[in-house]
């Protein structure tokens, strides 16, 4: 109700002789600040005096002075909300009730706190989870209802008297709600922890033992089993007997069922701790274990590998890999069920024993076609020799062998003929499925492996074929040796190296690029006239008359080929110059007279010079000299000179006669 002071603190505090107590405390006074505080031990109210009697452990006066003997007890509070107390050291006779007598200006209050001080350090308390199961992490808690700033303590965990390796987390609480020290240890118990003693030991700051609590761990776990076998090595021969015994070394809770497993599968009607196998067969070889279950789950023993020994069974051959490519490596593996494993092997190739091959594997580093065939083997161990199985077939694959290109035509082949070729081979695995030809052309393949070349060219020199299965094998190229008339016949001037000038020595060569057969004849002609039959046509001193269109012919047994016409050009200085007059050599004055300088020249005249009868050059340089109007004084002999790049030529004199016109005669 509203007439009460409000206090908060632990109801009871625990300690032991020589330790200390720290009492966390808060309060709220009804009015104003605290003026007086007395700490009583076992206070009793005296009705007569209306005061409390009892041992005064602590007293604060209004002036704040504290008697020196009160050092053991300390008021750590304040005047309005904190009432924390400390007693250090605490004694056995401090047990009982502490009374906090609080007075403000107008109000008074007595607050009681229980103090329990034991003679010796009291033990902590171990708290365990309700169930502990193997391999499941649990937290073990050690709780001590004590904590005091002036008296450090520690809690240590021990397993079977040995400090536990796992790290514990220690926490303390010194609050108005609770005072304790707690240590929490997380660990994953194993089945072997079952029944083991765990101790939480209370120690002082120096590690000196103060007290402890102990528990024996109850760890629920699946049955832990041991399997025993007779004979101990678990190796028997067919027909022998075997006994296996399952021992439960630990189970918590008790086991409920027993079963036996072979290769992970439960054996029917085997539900006792002993498994008797009489007259075993090789099929009973395998991994055996016993399984015992309890409420936690099934426990399994380690596996015992029972080996029932027997002679090798008929063998099979495994080939890595078939089909095999010629040149590759191949491994043969002889597979035969046997116990113990075979120690010796005999290998057969097409029924014939392979000498020196006694291992489980046969390795051929470089396979050849003759290695193909049936491989079989026989395995042998200490109990006997197995039978030879059906064997395995090795297929050796290789490209077509000895491929040749064959010409089917009669020889020789002439340009323009139709040529037929075939592609032949000796052997192939797998079979040939296609052919290739080189060079490529727009040729027919009328059937597989046959090539037809229509209108064979002069330049079809060689043809090669390939026969192909998974790989292509090329034949050496075959020469067609096509015969043809001479080709690319042309006239070539050998000398002179520059232009041909009249009088030069001239040689013309009849060239051709090729001819098959090589034996040829030459013919020279000019304007349809045969000039010679040599490869060269020679002129000791060429004359302009030799100029013209020349052709040469080359022929062999296949045919003849003509060159293009070749023009022979002879360069010479102007010659045969003459002056022609128009309209004639007699012209009436006043008319027009044209003198033309005619010449024969190669190259044509590039420059004309005119001369009169006095050999005086006239200021005219063209081929024609036009006199208009012509005068009588123009009468006389004229000559001209022509010049080209080769030289000069001059004409004889030609006389021009200019006569008077009738008018002139009439005037005279």
């Amino acid at each position: 109700d509203s007439s009460k002071w409000v206090f908060e603190h632990p109801e009871t505090l625990y300690a032991w002789e020589g330790a200390c107590v720290w009492i966390p405390c808060t309060y709220r006074a009804l009015d104003g600040d605290l003026e007086s505080f007395i700490l009583f031990h076992n206070p009793e109210y005296n009705k007569n005096t209306s005061k409390f009697d009892g041992t005064r452990l602590y007293e604060s006066t209004k002036d704040g002075k504290v008697p020196s003997e009160q050092k053991r007890v300390q008021f750590l509070g304040d005047k309005n909300k904190n009432c924390t107390l400390s007693i250090h050291p605490v004694h056995l006779n401090d047990s009982g009730q502490l009374g906090l007598r609080m007075e403000s200006k107008t109000e008074k209050w007595m607050e009681r706190i229980h103090l329990n001080v034991s003679e010796r350090p009291f033990p902590p308390h171990i708290q365990l989870p309700p169930e502990i199961q193997e391999s499941q992490e649990v937290t073990l808690t050690c709780l001590l209802n004590f904590s005091c700033y002036g008296y450090p303590i520690q809690l240590q965990w021990l397993l079977e008297g040995v400090p536990m390796r796992q790290a514990a987390v220690t926490s303390t609480s010194l609050t108005i709600k609770s005072v304790f020290t707690r240590s929490e240890l997380k660990f994953s118990p194993q089945w072997s922890h079952h029944g083991k003693i765990v101790t939480c030991q209370l120690q002082d700051a120096d590690g000196k033992f103060l007290s402890n609590d102990t528990v024996q761990l109850n760890v629920k776990h699946t049955p832990k089993l041991e399997i025993k076998v007779t004979p101990s090595d678990a190796i028997v021969r067919e027909g022998d007997s075997v006994t296996m015994t399952c021992e439960v070394s630990s189970s918590n809770p008790e086991y409920t069922t027993v079963s036996w497993l072979k290769d992970g599968t439960s054996l029917k009607k085997q539900n006792t701790f002993t498994l008797n196998l009489r007259e075993v067969t090789k099929d009973q070889s395998g991994k055996y274990c016993c399984q015992v279950s309890n409420d936690v789950g099934p426990g399994r023993s380690e596996e015992v590998f029972l080996q029932v020994q027997y002679a090798p069974e008929p063998s099979t051959v495994q080939i890595l890999h078939s089909p095999a490519v010629e040149g590759s490596q191949v491994e043969f593996l002889c597979m035969s069920l046997a116990n113990p494993l075979p120690t010796n092997y005999t290998w057969y190739h097409n029924g014939k024993e392979m000498q020196g091959r006694t291992e489980e594997k046969v390795h051929i580093p470089k396979i050849l076609p003759w290695h193909a065939g049936t491989y079989s083997c026989v395995a042998e161990n200490i109990l006997g020799t197995g039978q030879r199985g059906p064997g395995a077939e090795l297929d050796v694959q290789y490209p077509p062998k000895k491929v040749t290109t064959v010409i089917q035509n009669p020889m020789p082949i002439r340009e323009g003929d139709t040529v037929t070729l075939s592609c032949n081979y000796n052997s192939s695995n797998p079979s040939v499925t296609r052919y290739e030809w080189k060079p490529h052309g727009a040729w027919e393949e009328p059937s597989l492996g046959v090539l037809k070349i229509q209108n064979v060219g002069w330049d079809n020199t060689t043809i090669a074929c390939a026969a192909c299965n998974s790989w292509c094998s090329w034949a050496s190229p075959v020469a067609l040796n096509v015969q043809y008339a001479p080709r690319d016949v042309r006239v070539r001037k050998i000398k002179p190296l520059s232009e041909i000038h009249s009088g030069n020595s001239v040689s013309l060569q009849c060239d051709f690029s090729s001819s098959h057969p090589k034996e040829v004849q030459f013919f020279w002609e000019k304007n349809g006239r045969l000039l010679g039959k040599e490869s060269q046509l020679n002129f000791d001193s060429i004359s302009p008359e030799d100029a013209g269109s020349y052709s040469c012919w080359v022929n062999n047994s296949i045919g003849q080929t003509a060159s293009k016409a070749w023009t022979l050009e002879v360069l010479y200085a102007p010659r045969r110059l003459r002056v022609s007059m128009s309209p004639g050599d007699q012209v009436m004055e006043g008319k027009s007279a044209t003198l033309t300088c005619e010449s024969d020249a190669n190259p044509p005249v590039s420059h004309y010079t005119w001369f009169d009868w006095n050999n005086q050059s006239l200021p005219y340089h063209s081929q024609k000299l036009r006199l208009e109007p012509v005068k009588v004084q123009h009468s006389g002999a004229y000559w001209c000179q022509g010049t080209n790049s080769v030289g000069k030529g001059r004409s004889p004199l030609s006389t021009l006669t200019v006569y008077y016109s009738p008018e002139t005669i009439g005037r005279r």
């Epitope: 365990l128 079977e160 008297g161 040995v162 029944g195 083991k196 101790t199 070394s249």
Partner: antibody, heavy 116, light 112 residues
Framework: QVQLVQSGAEVKKPGASVKVSCKAS????????LHWVRQAPGQRLEWMGY????????EYNQNFKDRVTLTADKSASTAYMELSSLRSEDTAVYYC?????????WGQGTTLTVSS | DIVLTQSPDSLAVSAGERVTMNCKSS????????????LAWYQQKPGQPPKLLIY???TRESGVPDRFSGSGSGTDFTLTISSVQAEDVAIYYC????????FGGGTKLEIK
């Protein structure tokens, strides 16, 4: 010091039941398991089972599982072993025992005679 | 359960002689957490409860004469009395406490 004090000798008829007590002192009763071991005349020691007084958890030897019952009274720090359907071969000395980390404590033994 | 086999069943020796008796376990009794063998040896005289001689296979219980010693690890253990005295006549039991409890069949020691 640790003491385990057992109840006195018993004579029972076949088919009857017997309950033997074991009073513990000198240690915290709930801290350790209490085991029961018997010894028939001239025979080896034979473990029968244990009880964890902390939570009354029990574990039994399969040979006794159907006939033995272990109980504990925490307030009296006393453990009990009850054996039912008695037969003559149950004639033996019955011991309660407990282990500490480095020692074992045994009761003085209780002689049971089963006779018609 | 773990089976303990003791040998010999009985032996008679003269006082002052050295004597050894064996205990073989069907499984290891070594506890990996503290590397201790959870095997004890007891001496039992007629009409008395077993008296602990050795724990952890080789640690002598306080008050036990030092002529008694234990050895072995895993599955094979030995109790040795270096110089047999008349008061040593008794049956000696081995006891494993790693998993549940089991006892050996005992070895009876007599004085010639």
């Amino acid at each position: 010091q640790v003491q385990l004090v057992q109840s006195g000798a018993e004579v029972k008829k076949p088919g009857a039941s017997v309950k033997v007590s074991c009073k513990a002192s000198g240690y915290t009763f709930t801290s350790y398991w209490l085991h029961w071991v018997r010894q028939a005349p001239g025979q080896r020691l034979e473990w029968m089972g244990y009880i964890n007084p902390r939570n009354d958890y029990t574990e039994y030897n399969q040979n006794f599982k159907d006939r033995v019952t272990l109980t504990a009274d925490k307030s009296a720090s006393t453990a009990y072993m009850e054996l039912s359907s008695l037969r003559s071969e149950d004639t033996a000395v019955y011991y309660c025992a407990r282990r500490d980390i480095t020692t074992f404590y045994w009761g003085q033994g209780t002689t049971l005679t089963v006779s018609s | 359960d773990i089976v303990l086999t003791q040998s010999p069943d009985s032996l008679a020796v003269s006082a002052g002689e050295r004597v050894t008796m064996n205990c073989k376990s069907s499984q290891s009794v070594l506890y990996s957490a503290n590397h201790k063998n959870y095997l004890a040896w007891y001496q039992q005289k007629p009409g008395q409860p077993p008296k602990l001689l050795i724990y952890w296979a080789s640690t002598r219980e306080s008050g036990v004469p030092d002529r008694f010693s234990g050895s072995g690890s895993g599955t094979d253990f030995t109790l040795t009395i270096s110089s047999v005295q008349a008061e040593d006549v008794a049956i000696y039991y081995c006891h494993q406490y790693l998993s549940s409890w089991t006892f050996g069949g005992g070895t009876k020691l007599e004085i010639k």
